[in-house]
């Protein structure tokens, strides 16, 4: 009935603010308009992200968290809406923004890439594994020679700053290594990486990038690959990679390369063993790699190949461990 009422006016929210609450994370907050009549009606809000990347959504709440790079600034608008089955009434927009941080674009880092690895934990008995993080980047083309870069990551609510850097010839940080982190790929949380910089000659523009832990996780190679030859058969066996994921979470790819004729046999497997027929005149190179599969998480990319094991002519009954 209200929607059909000519005089009914929807008023925009008030006190709309945007606040950076963490690396690459902002909190949008607003209040319902105190002058809004019929405040008992089921009001909603239409949020529009204008920059850095356009997005829009509806919410009943009066705050909203956004995870996005902030080095180009952030701008958003919000309006009050009232929906019915056949029409939507909307107020005017209110807008707010976070200004882009100072610095010339050419001074910020470029080509930021990050990868995570699962490694044995010597640190605490609670979990036998920990996740390391390595990030590399290129110095900005317009960055003065005295520029120094500093990297931070945020995963969930926790933020860590880098303590171990690799440097270029001018002593500028160009890579960072965290031996252990709190990163995991259990949920949908994104990894936020922030690199800021300092120089006596210019303002260095910071840079933010978001990564999916799933996409940057480098699965370890399968362990203890063993190969045995019996008559004209190759018996290949291996153990799951060093990983927090249990056995049933892995798919494997096996590569058997005939070094004599160049033929490559590839097998996709769920099991951790395989038998293959071979001739008795060729030498073979065997490698295995792994990928985490569903239902343990969304399928990830293939990990590194295990070291090649060579068997065959003049290498009968060879067993190698890696």
């Amino acid at each position: 009935d209200l929607l059909n009422h000519k005089k009914f006016l929807l008023l925009p929210p008030v006190n709309f603010t945007i606040k950076a609450t963490g690396l690459a994370q902002v909190l949008l907050h607003w209040d319902p308009n105190p002058d809004q009549e019929q405040r008992h009606v089921d009001l909603e809000y239409h949020v529009k992200i204008n920059a850095p990347q356009e997005d829009e959504y509806d919410t009943r709440k009066t705050e909203s968290k956004c995870v996005t790079p902030l080095h180009e600034g952030f701008a958003a608008s919000v309006r009050t809406i009232l929906k019915s089955s056949h029409t939507t009434l909307a107020s005017s927009w209110v807008s707010a923004e976070l200004k882009a941080p100072p610095g010339s674009p050419g001074t910020s880092v470029t080509n930021l890439t990050c990868t995570t690895h699962t490694v044995v934990s010597s640190h605490t008995h609670l979990r036998p594994y920990q996740v390391s993080l390595r990030c590399t980047w290129l110095v900005g083309k317009d960055a003065p020679e005295d520029t120094q870069y500093f990297l931070y990551y945020r995963f969930g609510v926790l933020t860590e700053k880098c303590q171990e850097y690799s440097r270029d010839a001018l002593n500028r940080n160009t890579a960072c290594w965290f031996p252990r982190t709190f990163i995991n790929s259990k949920g949908f949380e994104q990894l936020a990486v922030h690199i800021n910089g300092s120089s006596k000659r210019a303002a260095i523009k910071p840079f933010d990038q978001l990564f999916s832990p799933l996409a940057i996780d480098q699965v370890n190679p399968p362990r203890n690959v063993t190969v045995e030859i019996e008559s004209n058969s190759l018996y290949i066996q291996w153990e799951k990679p060093l990983s927090a994921f249990p056995d049933h979470c892995f798919n494997y790819e096996l590569k058997i390369y005939n070094t004599k004729n160049g033929h490559i046999q590839k097998e996709k497997l769920i099991a951790n063993k395989f038998i293959s027929k071979i001739d008795d005149v060729s030498t073979y190179s065997i490698q295995v790699r792994a990928a985490v599969s569903s239902p343990c998480r969304m399928p990830g990319r293939w990990g590194e190949w295990s070291q090649p094991i060579y068997v065959g002519k003049e290498r009968k009954s060879l067993v190698e461990w890696h």
Epitope: H123, G156, T159, F182
Partner: antibody, heavy 117, light 106 residues
Amino acid sequence: VQLVESDGGLVQPGRSLKLSCAASGFTFSDFYMAWVRQAPTKGLEWVATISYDGSSAYYRDSVKGRFTISRDNAKSTLYLQMDSLSSEDTATYYCARHDGYYPFDYWGQGVMVTVSS
Amino acid sequence: DIRMTQSPASLSASLGETVNIECLASEDIYSDLAWYQQKPGKSPQLLIYDANSLQNGVPSRFSGSGSGTQYSLKINSLQSEDVATYFCQQYNNYWTFGGGTKLELK
């Protein structure tokens, strides 16, 4: 692993108090540390957490701006500076070891802080 | 913030009985859940972490299970020394505890 909190005591509303926690039996700088409190006959409430080197600190909303967690890795000691105390802050305060997204695996014996006039 | 709802608030059980305590998270915590035991006048002790991993030195009659938002602690063959208050805790997004379950002997 041992965590030993300093004496608490009775403090008037609006006043300040600083708690300390001496750690031993492990490499202090290898762990995040936290303060957790428990009001009389009530449940447990996380108060604050600090990162390895003290560069990052996290607080529950009700203590933000009033409490400051800090650490001295050279002395293997954790601190909690509590300002503008109110009766709602009356509790046993525990210092606890953890490591980011981990549970609290070791706890101190706890120290009672009573805020009353 | 994630809210943890523990039930029951208190329970009485006989020696040798099996006890179950439930914990419900307000959102998925991806098994980032711990259980603690607290005896009167003592500090809490970690029993279970990552929903189902037993902490060193904890008797095997304690076990944890669950995933997503629903978790439980099971005590098989209740002993007199198990009389205590039990708390669940999530550590997926900050750190929040359930309200506790006071376990008494019948």
